[in-house]
Interface confidence: medium
Amino acid sequence: LVPHLGDREKRDSVCPQGKYIHPQNNSICCTKCHKGTYLYNDCPGPGQDTDCRECESGSFTASENHLRHCLSCSKCRKEMGQVEISSCTVDRDTVCGCRKNQYRHYWSENLFQCFNCSLCLNGTVHLSCQEKQNTVCTCHAGFFLRENECVSCSNCKKSLECTKLCLPQIENVKGTEDSGTT
């Protein structure tokens, strides 16, 4: 079976790399536009130049192309805590990231939010905070991990996952409760 190609891919594959097939005349291969530019007019004939124009402010193309319009620059989402790492240029989109001591949490493929790295209070750092992952903490004795924070075993209820880690403390609490009732 031959894999299905879209019309544009089909047309491009007939021409050598760096060229595309003229949309009105499939015997002509036009040179693609450089990154930072877009297609204003197709080449008039073989060996003639494609009319490429530079992207306007607020738009870009990051690779050679035959797009009729440049792509709009992304905006960093301030309400997600994002900051601009580098501004948009004609040949590169805006790069957004997080502040120091924060990590990216991806809600979906194209949406991330910046969160503060856990400090591992009442515990130790098992794995340092990374660009896309929070610190991994190991808790001291008498504490258990809940939502990546070390919480005192006094907050451990019997129904929670913490019961194994906090078993001695729970039994002590149970013992004091039992001794007060007759």
Partner: nanobody, 121 residues
Framework: EVQLLESGGGLVQPGGSLRLSCAAS????????MHWVRQAPGKGLEWVSA????????YYADSVKGRFTISRDNSKNTLYLQMNSLRAEDTAVYYC??????????????WGQGTLVTVSS
């Protein structure tokens, strides 16, 4: 006082549709991103979808992409979630929430009380 009030939940058969609404008051609704989050019985919270303040940008968890559509009407201070092709695994309490906090994922400054969606034949 900030209030978020969800409605529209109920019992629906697999493959069916529901439209959830979230009526907001007590803050400038058109200035903030809004989210839908859900909690299935006996499970943790799961982020479902988000929409930008003006409604131009929408985001979806992979588990609902192509089936759910988030929208908002800023003139009515209302957030919506259109749920199509519902599956048993979509059974959960659905919450609308505003403004995520920076301390941890799924930490919001305000939540609604939730509306239960049950998908069962």
């Amino acid at each position: 006082e900030v209030q978020l009030l969800e409605s529209g939940g109920g019992l629906v058969q697999p493959g069916g549709s529901l439209r959830l609404s979230c009526a907001a008051s007590g803050f400038t609704f058109g200035n903030v991103d809004m989210h839908w989050v859900r909690q299935a019985p006996g499970k943790g919270l799961e982020w479902v979808s988000a929409i930008s303040s003006a409604g131009g940008e929408t985001y979806y968890a992979d588990s609902v992409k192509g089936r759910f559509t988030i929208s908002r009407d800023n003139s009515k201070n209302t957030l919506y979630l259109q749920m199509n092709s519902l599956r048993a695994e979509d059974t959960a309490v659905y919450y609308c929430a505003k403004r995520m906090l920076a301390n941890s994922p799924l930490a919001f400054d305000y939540w609604g009380q939730g509306t239960l969606v049950t998908v069962s034949s």
